[in-house]
């Protein structure tokens, strides 16, 4: 396997993770794919300290994170447990609002202008943050 010991160019290192902050928007699924192509994942917020770090870098802009409930319960994309983990929802959120008229509810979480979280329609083209961990062994798949 291989280990990443330093962050790629244009990524920001913080607490043994690397972060990349987009400056354009994509739908949640497209942002997720972008991160995966970079051997990363949409940001998973595990502490108040990490929340403040991300919030500082994104500013007051709606920004996707790696949290969704498209298959029922809320899940972090890296498998981090949602129920016992850090949360920073806005009051009354998540509300799975259907009143937007776009069809369905709201299944993807994003940072709002004050940093707190909201659920929204996954197709909205918001900015996003990718995260990858340093020193995380990555076994290359066998060649077929």
């Amino acid at each position: 396997g291989s280990e990443r010991t330093c962050c790629p160019v244009n990524w920001v290192e913080h607490e043994r993770s690397c972060y990349w902050f987009s400056r354009s928007g994509k739908a949640w699924a497209d942002a997720d794919n972008y991160c995966r192509l970079e051997d990363a994942h949409l940001v998973v917020v595990t502490s108040w300290e990490e929340q403040k770090f991300v919030q500082h870098h994104i500013g007051p802009v709606n920004t996707w994170m790696g949290l969704h409930d498209q298959n029922g319960p809320w899940k972090w994309v890296d498998g981090t447990d949602y129920e016992t983990g850090f949360k920073n929802w806005r009051p009354e959120q998540p509300d799975d609002w259907y009143g937007h008229g776009l069809g369905g509810g709201e299944d993807c979480a994003h940072f709002t202008d004050d940093g707190r979280w909201n659920d929204d329609v996954c197709q909205r083209p918001y900015r996003w943050v990718c995260e990858t961990e340093l020193d995380k062994a990555s076994q290359e798949p066998p060649l077929l």
Epitope: P8, K26, Y34
Partner: antibody, heavy 118, light 107 residues
Amino acid sequence: EVQLLESGGGLVQPGGSLRLSCAASGFTFSSYAMSWVRQAPGKGLEWVSAISGRGVNTFDADSVKGRFTISRDNSKNTLYLQMNSLRAEDTAVYYCAKERSGSYFDYWGQGTLVTVSS
Amino acid sequence: DIQMTQSPSSVSASVGDRVTITCRASQGISDWLAWYQQKPGKAPRLLIYGASSLQSGVPSRFSGSGSGTDFTLTISNLQPEDFATYYCQQTNSFPWTFGQGTKVEIK
């Protein structure tokens, strides 16, 4: 200097298999996603498959899903495309391409021709 | 899939002319668009990425603009080496898709 050199193309019968290779040099291969893009004779460009730098994540066009497999060996700086169940419509020049941030192709190989015919 | 439609399919121009090629996406792609140049028998060459950023080594007579669904590649002061086929490509969503190409021919 970045160089990408494809090989493995040739004439194959419908239903047959072929494995294309792309030897890379001049950059840190494992740090970049790579893609295969094809171009049928006299036609436009069609993206085929992409793979992340470590080879963990792959993405495929619907037209090749389940038939083609993209892979890489970072110890050999080589990208592969395993092509199975080939069809006449797969006939094309196949290019490997290095991706820059944003998934744009900043370097391309010279291409290798795959002809599927009986 | 996102469809990319280029116009015109071909254009005849003279050295020194200003040539404009347009590319329209079937849905919004923000600025996730690139332009490539391809000459017969050769691999494509990246000219513009992010809709308007000039790739290193590409002459400044090439410029790109647009956002959302409508994009433009402009070649000002067309040079002999610019006669080629030009493709747009979106990387907003998988599968990444290309326009059908615009051939710039000598008048």
